[in-house]
Interface confidence: low
C-alpha cells in the first residue's frame, strides 16, 4: 500500500485490545481545505516504541488503515480511498509492548466535519436575571455550533455545563453566577448537527468576580488638626484581596475589585457640595468638620456593601481668635483672614443640642480688610444667635468651596448670644459674716459660665454707704465666692456682682445691703 492511501489489507499487528488504561484517546477528524483532511489524537502512557494506526470503516463494511508511525496527527486527501461524502467510522489502534490499544470510535461525514475554533477575541460578560451571560462573535465561517463551558472556583474542581445550540453570528451562554467567590470559565465549540464532530480546544480563561464584591475590611485614623486647619485621613488596614482560581491568578481582567472612598462633610450644610468620591489610594486632607466616610467596593457587576465610619468634629477651640462686636444695628464677627478671595462658612449651634440643629451662613468670596481680618455681620432681625444661650461657632474657609476636600477649619469657639451682658448677670447673691471685719459673698454661677472661654471674670463691687467709697474685686471665672475684709462694724454696705466677657462689660446684680453688727463686750 502507498503511504498516502488508506490500505485495505489486514494491519501488520494482531487484533487484540489489551483493555489497558493507557492508549489513544480524544480522536478528532475534520476537513482542513477543499480536498484535504486531518485526524489527530492524544496518547496516554509511555510513548517509546509506540506505532499508531488510523483505522477507517466505510458504510459498505470495508475497512482500511493509515500507518502514522510515532506521530499523533495524520493528513490525507479525498483521493486516499476514504469516502468523504458518506458516513465513516474512525478510530486509532496503537501497537505498543506487544499489545494493541484502541481509542473510542468516531462516526462522521468527513466533508462536513469542520475544525471548530473556541470563542476567540473578546468574550463579553454581563449579568442577566441573577445569571452570568457570556457573548462573543462567532468565529468566521463557523455559524452553527454546540457550545460547552467548564467552570471552577478557587476551592472546587472543573464542572461541565452546556450552552445549547447556537446558530447566529454572535453566540451566547447563560452560566451560574457565584455570590461570594470568583470563578474561572472556559468555553469550547463543535459543529452543530454533524454526528461525531470533535470539540474545539478550550478558550482562554474568562475570569468572573463574585456577584457581591467583598466587603471592605479597612480601618482609618485621622491625624491632629494642623496649623493650616486641616488633618490627614490615613488608611490603617488595606482591603483584603479576592482569592482567585488557578487560571485567573496573576493578570485576571474581569475580577478586579475597585474600592472608592465616599466623603460626606456633615458640618456646614449650607455649602454647595456635601459629598465627594475618591480612589481609596488617594487619602485626602480634611477640615476639622464632622464627616461620614464610606468605603464602597465594586466590580464589573456594580457596587457591593459598603462600610461607613463617623469622623467626629475636632472640638479644639481657639478662645482668642474671634472678636465679636455687638452694636445697635447688629453683630459683627472678626477673625484673622486666611488668604485673598476666600469663601467662609460660619456655623453655629446651641451647645448641648444635636448636631443636626446647626445653622450656617456662607459668605461671598472676600479679601482681608486693612487689618488683615475677615468679617461676617448679621442684623438683630435675622434672629441669628439671638437667643440668650451658649452657641458653639466654627468657621471654615475655602478658596474653592465647590471642592469638598479643600475646606479648612479657621477656628472653633463659643459665643453667648442675645443680650449677653444682661443675661450673664449673676443671681442669688448672698452675704454671710465671716469674722469681725470680713464677710463672704456667694452667688449662683452666671449663665455665661456654661459657655467655655466666654466668661472672662466676675467683678464684685462693695460700696460704703457712709463714705460712699467703692471697691471692686476681680474674681476668677471658675469661682463663685469672695471674702471682703477690712470692713467696719456698724457701717452699712451694698454689694453687687457682674460677669464680664472679653468684649462686654456685664450688668451689675441687684444691690445687696449688709452690715457687720457691733460686738458688745460684757
Amino acid at each position: 500500500c502507498r503511504t498516502s492511501e488508506c490500505c485495505f489489507q489486514d494491519p501488520p499487528y494482531p487484533d487484540a485490545d489489551s483493555g489497558s488504561a493507557s492508549g489513544p484517546r480524544d480522536l478528532r477528524c475534520y476537513r482542513i481545505s477543499s480536498d484535504r483532511y486531518e485526524c489527530s489524537w492524544q496518547y496516554e502512557g509511555p510513548t517509546a516504541g509506540v506505532s499508531h494506526f488510523l483505522r477507517c470503516c466505510l458504510s459498505s463494511g470495508r475497512c482500511c488503515y493509515f500507518a502514522a508511525g510515532s506521530a499523533t496527527r495524520l493528513q490525507f486527501s479525498d483521493q486516499a480511498g476514504v469516502s468523504v461524502l458518506y458516513t465513516v467510522t474512525l478510530w486509532v489502534e496503537s501497537w505498543a509492548r506487544n499489545q494493541t490499544e484502541k481509542s473510542p470510535e468516531v462516526t462522521l461525514q468527513l466533508y462536513n466535519s469542520v475544525k471548530y475554533e473556541p470563542p476567540l477575541g473578546d468574550i463579553k460578560v454581563s449579568k442577566l436575571a441573577g445569571q452570568l451571560r457570556m457573548e462573543w462573535e462567532t468565529p468566521d465561517n463557523q455559524v452553527g455550533a454546540e457550545v460547552q463551558f467548564r467552570h471552577r472556583t478557587p476551592s472546587s474542581p472543573w464542572k461541565l455545563g452546556d450552552c445549547g445550540p447556537q446558530d447566529d453570528d454572535t453566540e451566547s451562554c447563560l452560566c451560574p453566577l457565584e455570590m461570594n467567590v470568583a470563578q474561572e470559565f472556559q468555553l469550547r465549540r463543535r459543529q452543530l448537527g454533524s454526528q461525531g464532530s470533535s470539540w474545539s480546544k478550550w478558550s482562554s480563561p474568562v475570569c468572573v468576580p463574585p456577584e457581591n464584591p467583598p466587603q471592605p475590611q479597612v480601618r482609618f485614623s485621622v491625624e491632629q488638626l494642623g496649623q493650616d486647619g486641616r488633618r490627614r485621613l490615613t488608611l490603617k488596614e488595606q482591603p483584603t484581596q479576592l482569592e482567585l482560581p488557578e487560571g485567573c491568578q496573576g493578570l485576571a481582567p474581569g475580577t478586579e475589585v475597585t474600592y472608592r472612598l465616599q466623603l460626606h462633610m456633615l458640618s456646614c450644610p449650607c455649602k454647595a457640595k456635601a459629598t465627594r468620591t475618591l480612589h481609596l489610594g488617594k487619602m485626602p486632607y480634611l477640615s476639622g468638620a464632622a464627616y461620614n466616610v464610606a468605603v464602597i467596593s465594586s466590580n464589573q457587576f456594580g457596587p457591593g456593601l459598603n462600610q461607613t465610619w463617623h469622623i467626629p468634629a475636632d472640638t479644639h477651640t481657639e478662645p482668642v481668635a474671634l472678636n465679636i462686636s455687638v452694636g445697635t444695628n447688629g453683630t459683627t464677627m472678626y477673625w484673622p483672614a486666611r488668604a485673598q478671595s476666600m469663601t467662609y462658612c460660619i456655623e453655629w449651634q446651641p451647645v448641648g443640642q444635636d448636631g443636626g440643629l446647626a445653622t450656617c451662613s456662607l459668605t461671598a468670596p472676600q479679601d482681608p480688610d486693612p487689618a488683615g481680618m475677615a468679617t461676617y455681620s448679621w442684623s438683630r432681625e435675622s434672629g441669628a444667635m439671638g437667643q440668650e444661650k451658649c452657641y458653639y461657632i466654627t468657621i471654615f474657609a475655602s478658596a474653592h468651596p465647590e471642592k469638598l476636600t479643600l475646606w479648612s477649619t479657621v477656628l472653633s469657639t463659643y459665643h453667648f448670644g442675645g443680650n449677653a451682658s444682661a443675661a450673664g448677670t449673676p443671681h442669688h447673691v448672698s452675704v454671710k459674716n465671716h469674722s469681725l471685719d470680713s464677710v463672704s459673698v456667694d452667688w449662683a454661677p452666671s449663665l455665661l459660665s456654661t459657655c467655655p472661654g466666654v466668661l472672662k471674670e466676675y467683678v464684685v463691687r462693695c460700696r460704703d454707704e457712709d463714705s460712699k467709697q467703692v471697691s471692686e474685686h476681680p474674681v476668677q471665672p471658675t469661682e463663685t465666692q469672695v471674702t471682703l475684709s477690712g470692713l467696719r462694724a456698724g457701717v452699712a454696705y451694698t454689694v453687687q456682682v457682674r460677669a464680664d466677657t472679653a468684649w462686654l462689660r456685664g450688668v451689675w446684680s441687684q444691690p445687696q445691703r449688709f452690715s457687720i453688727e457691733v460686738q458688745v463686750s460684757d
Epitope: 442577566l128 436575571a129 451571560r133 457573548e135 452553527g144 445549547g164 445550540p165 446558530d167 447566529d168 453570528d169 454572535t170 451566547s172 452543530l192 448537527g193
Partner: nanobody, 118 residues
Framework: EVQLVESGGGLVQAGGSLRLSCAVS????????VAWSRQAPGSQRELVAR???????NYADSVKGRFTISRDNDKNMVYLQMNSLKPEDTAVYYC????????????WGQGTQVTVSS
C-alpha cells in the same frame, strides 16, 4: 409567560402591500432569533423569513425580494413588510421567537389572517 401577538393582517388586492407586526414578551428578546411562518388551508406550515439576534436574515425562495423582516430590540417588536402580494400568499401568518434545543423556533403566536384577492 412567553407571549407573541400578531397584528396587521387583512384583505388586500394582488400587487398590494401589508405590514405585519408582532409584539413579543416573556423572553430576553434581544438575544433571540425571531421568525414569520405561514400556513395556507390544506398545506403544511412553512418558514417565510427569519432574523437572528445580530440581524442576519433568511427568506423562503418564494418571497425573496418581496418580503422584508426587521426587528426593534428596544420595543420587543418584529415586523414583516410584504410587497407585490400574490394570491398564493394567502395564509395565516404566525410570528415565532426563541430557540428550542434543536435550533428550531420555540414559541409561536396565534396568527393573523392575510387574504390576497385577484
Amino acid at each position: 409567560e412567553v407571549q407573541l401577538v400578531e397584528s396587521g393582517g387583512g384583505l388586500v388586492q394582488a400587487g398590494g402591500s401589508l405590514r405585519l407586526s408582532c409584539a413579543v414578551s416573556g423572553i430576553a428578546f434581544r438575544y433571540n432569533s425571531v421568525a414569520w411562518s405561514r400556513q395556507a388551508p390544506g398545506s403544511q406550515r412553512e418558514l417565510v423569513a427569519r432574523i437572528t439576534n445580530s440581524a442576519r436574515t433568511n427568506y423562503a425562495d418564494s418571497v425573496k425580494g418581496r418580503f422584508t423582516i426587521s426587528r426593534d430590540n428596544d420595543k420587543n417588536m418584529v415586523y414583516l413588510q410584504m410587497n407585490s402580494l400574490k394570491p398564493e400568499d394567502t395564509a395565516v401568518y404566525y410570528c415565532g421567537a426563541g430557540r428550542s434545543m434543536t435550533g428550531d423556533v420555540a414559541y409561536w403566536g396565534q396568527g393573523t389572517q392575510v387574504t390576497v384577492s385577484s
